[in-house]
Every structure is written in C-alpha cells, then in structure tokens.
C-alpha cells in the first residue's frame, strides 16, 4: 500500500507481550494532521478498528485499547491514517507491530550456564526447557523491545530445550523465556521465573543499547 501520506508510527504501551485477559494500548501517531486512524490486524482473526484522531501540538494520534486480551486479538498490527472519511484515503502503513498473548500454557524453566553470575567477558548461555512439547522458545530481556527466538531441540530426558548463547558477558540483566507452538506463533506460554544474570568486574549492571528502541516501540518481525 503506497498511501497518499507518509506512514504513521505505532507503539504498544506498556509493551507488545500481553498477558491473557489484560489490555494493551496501541498508539498510532503522526505529525500529519490525520482525522482518522485505522488499525488493521493480520493473524488468526483479521480485524480493522477505527478511531477519530486527537490533535495536540502538531501531532495527531489515536489510542486503541486492545483487550481483554485473547487469542483472536494477537497478531500483526499496522496503523493507517486518513485525512478524509468517506471515502478513506489511506496513508502508507506503519511498520508492523507483533502483539503476542502470553500466559496460555505452563511456564518453561530458565537456567544459565555456567551460572547466573559470570565474570566480565566470560561466555554465558541461557537454556529454556519444558516437559511441554514447545516448538519454539522466546527469550526476552527486561528493557529490550524484541525477543530472541530459537527452535526447541529434540526431546532429551523428557524435556524440550533451546539454548541461547549470549556470548561474552558485558552487562547483566533480567531474562524470561516463553514457549510457543509452530502453528500459533502469537500465542505464548506463561513466563518462566525471571533469571537475573549478574556480571562481576563490571561497574554497571545496566545494558546500554542506545541504538535499540524502548520496550514501547514496534518490535521487529520475528514470529514468522
């Protein structure tokens, strides 16, 4: 869709991972004075929502309240602006934003090798495992917008596991992992218990990533 105006931006508040029955606000905004915003979802159940734009300080925006969250509401969202209503003249679409429902299945376990406390520069691998036959595991880090995804390996000792090599440790962080099934990429398990990875011999325990978007932005395409 080329669009008669440039694309708006689409953000998720508080973030794109949404627990079952909870609500997420998808904010579509632009410095073009759009009178209308349309939010389109592709996924298990396709839908389009419409809101009239609000205008403040040269910015037009619309806040779409999505919830209570259920499987049909998960999917890839795109936002469009329109300066007219009947007919609509749609802008180019926003960058896609994947909204995932979590809390549907039993939580996996998350562990660190060689352990959760490592020396700066030492290699660390996080392992996510479960007795449930998840096809895919997703590793999220607090404060980061997107997740890493790995296929689960074959069943070993009654569990399905994926290993996430983090490489040489520089900064710590709190990690969680989720499991999902191949045919339902937007539907994830409960979160594992959080795992705090600490790096010793390093002055900061934060993860400076100035080039990365905040947790409220659209996450890159990672589900398909």
């Amino acid at each position: 869709h080329e669009g008669v105006h440039r694309k708006p931006s689409l953000l998720a508040h508080p973030g794109p991972l949404v627990k079952s029955e909870e609500t997420v606000i998808l904010q579509c905004w632009s410095d073009v004075r759009f009178q209308h915003f349309l939010l389109h979802r592709e996924g298990k159940f396709k839908d389009t929502l419409h809101l009239i734009g609000e205008h403040h300080d040269g910015v037009s925006k619309a806040n779409f309240s999505i919830g209570p969250m259920m499987q049909d509401l998960a999917g890839t969202y795109r936002c469009y602006g329109s300066v007219t209503h009947s007919p609509y003249q749609l802008s180019a679409p926003s960058d896609p934003l994947d909204i995932v429902i979590t809390g549907l299945y039993e939580k996996p376990s998350l562990s660190a090798q060689p352990g959760p406390t490592v020396l700066a520069g030492e290699s660390v691998t996080l392992s996510c495992s479960s007795r449930s036959s998840y096809d895919m595991y997703h590793l999220s880090r607090e404060g980061e917008a997107h997740e890493r995804r790995f296929s689960a390996g074959p069943k070993v000792n009654g569990t399905f596991q994926a290993d996430f090599p983090l490489g040489p440790a520089t900064h710590g962080g709190t990690y969680r992992c989720f499991g999902s099934f191949r045919d339902s990429p937007y539907e994830w398990s409960n979160s594992s218990d959080p795992l705090l990875v600490s790096v010793t011999g390093n002055p900061s325990n934060s993860w400076p990533s100035p080039t990365e978007p905040s947790s409220e932005t659209g996450n890159p395409r990672h589900l398909h």
Partner: antibody, heavy 124, light 108 residues
C-alpha cells in the same frame, strides 16, 4: 440510519452455488464489519464468517472454510456471500449483519444491524 | 469451539412477571464478548445486550445482562406482551463465534 438490504430468495440444486448480496446505505461501509449468519428452518443461528471491506480481509468459521467466499465491493457498498457445493442441509435463511462498532468495543462480533434475510432452498 | 447451552429450553410466564434466562459456556468467555438477542418469528434477530451487560441502543431498561466466566444471565424485570419471543446468547471472544440454541419465552 444504516440499513442492510439483501437480495431475493433463491432455489438451487444440490452441488451448485449461490451468491447472496447485502447492500448497505448510510454510514461508512468501508470500515464496517459485515458478517453472515444463517438459520436453518426451526433451528438456531450459525455464524459463517465476515469481512471488513476496506482491506478485503475475511474470516471464516472452520466449518465453512473452502466452501464459502465472502467479498465486498466498496464502490457499491455491497457485501457478498457465495456458498458452493450446496446440499440440502444448506437450506436456510441467510442474514448479513453489521458488527457493533463503538470506540469501547474491540471485537465487532455483536450484531446491531441485520438485513431482512434471504431464503435459500436447496432441492433436487 | 465454545459451546453455549441455554436453559430452560422453554419458559412459560405471564406479562408483568420476571424472566431469568441462563447461558452456560463450555469454556470461559470474557464478559466483554457476550451478547444477547431477541428474535420473533419471520424476523431478523435484534441485539439486546453486548459485553454481557451493556444495553444496545433503544433497548428498554427492563432488559439487563450479567455474569462472567462460564455463566451468564439475561433478566427481563417485568414482562411486556411484546417480550415473548426466542432469546439467543452469543460469544464473540473466540472464533468461530457461536450462539446458544435459544430459549423460547412463551405466554403462560
């Protein structure tokens, strides 16, 4: 006031197809969610699927997947439902209905405006 | 799919009485996604309640909806002659959207 007006009754042979139309007047058809619901004689209601005209995206109930096609023509504000491989069990009244669209409703699955219904009889 | 079971199948009451219709879901339905309809013979259904408890435009306040999870209720506080009809519940929280089999409300 929005109105939905459907095409007239049809009598069809088993194995054939039927295409029912639903013309909207009033409001903004493009962003409507138009669903199709059928009701066999003396029976309850059954959702078949729906479409949002502006993006042409349709959803179908699994039961009808592959046999039903729902389309919309924005230029004439008309939605269509085509059902193929008809059998006697498809004899029913077919309704088009608009999904309730208010800012606090995130799923347009409650139907506030209905067409008058189209009777489709499948008989050899 | 979610199966909705309505009870009773038929309810015989007199005008002025209170009617209580029940709808039970085979699995939990968010109350945001449950509706009630009234249908009279030869007519299209009419939306009464959406979101389990919100009255649709133009619906008299003698109609009220309540419930959550798997159990939902439509109450008509004081029956008027025009209220005798078939009532259907519907869930739209999980595709395919499904309807109950209906409760027939008849004059005693």
């Amino acid at each position: 006031q929005v109105q939905l007006v459907q095409s007239g009754a049809e009598v069809k042979k088993p194995g054939s197809s039927v295409k029912v139309s639903c013309k909207a007047s009033g409001g903004t058809f493009s962003s409507y969610a138009i669903s199709w619901v059928r009701q066999a004689p003396g029976q309850g209601l059954e959702w078949m699927g729906g479409i949002i005209p502006i993006f042409g995206t349709a959803n179908y109930a699994q039961k009808f997947q592959g046999r039903v096609t729902i389309t919309a023509d924005e230029s004439t504000s008309t939605a269509y439902m085509e059902l193929s491989s008809l059998r006697s069990e498809d004899t029913a009244v077919y309704y088009c209905a608009r999904g309730l669209d208010t800012p606090n409703v995130v799923v347009k699955g409650a139907f506030d405006i209905w067409g008058q219904g189209t009777t489709v009889t499948v008989s050899s | 799919e979610i199966v909705l079971t309505q009870s009773p199948g038929t309810l015989s009451l007199s005008p002025g009485e209170r009617a209580t219709l029940s709808c039970r879901a085979s699995q939990s339905v968010s109350s945001s996604y449950l509706a009630w309809y009234q249908q009279k013979p030869g007519r299209a259904p009419r939306l009464l309640i959406y979101g389990a408890s919100s009255r649709a435009t133009g619906i008299p306040d003698r109609f009220s909806g309540s419930g959550s999870g798997t159990d939902f209720t439509l109450t008509i506080s004081r029956l008027e002659p025009e209220d005798f009809a078939v009532y259907y519940c519907q869930q739209y929280g999980s595709s395919p959207w499904t309807f109950g089999q209906g409760t027939k409300l008849e004059i005693k």
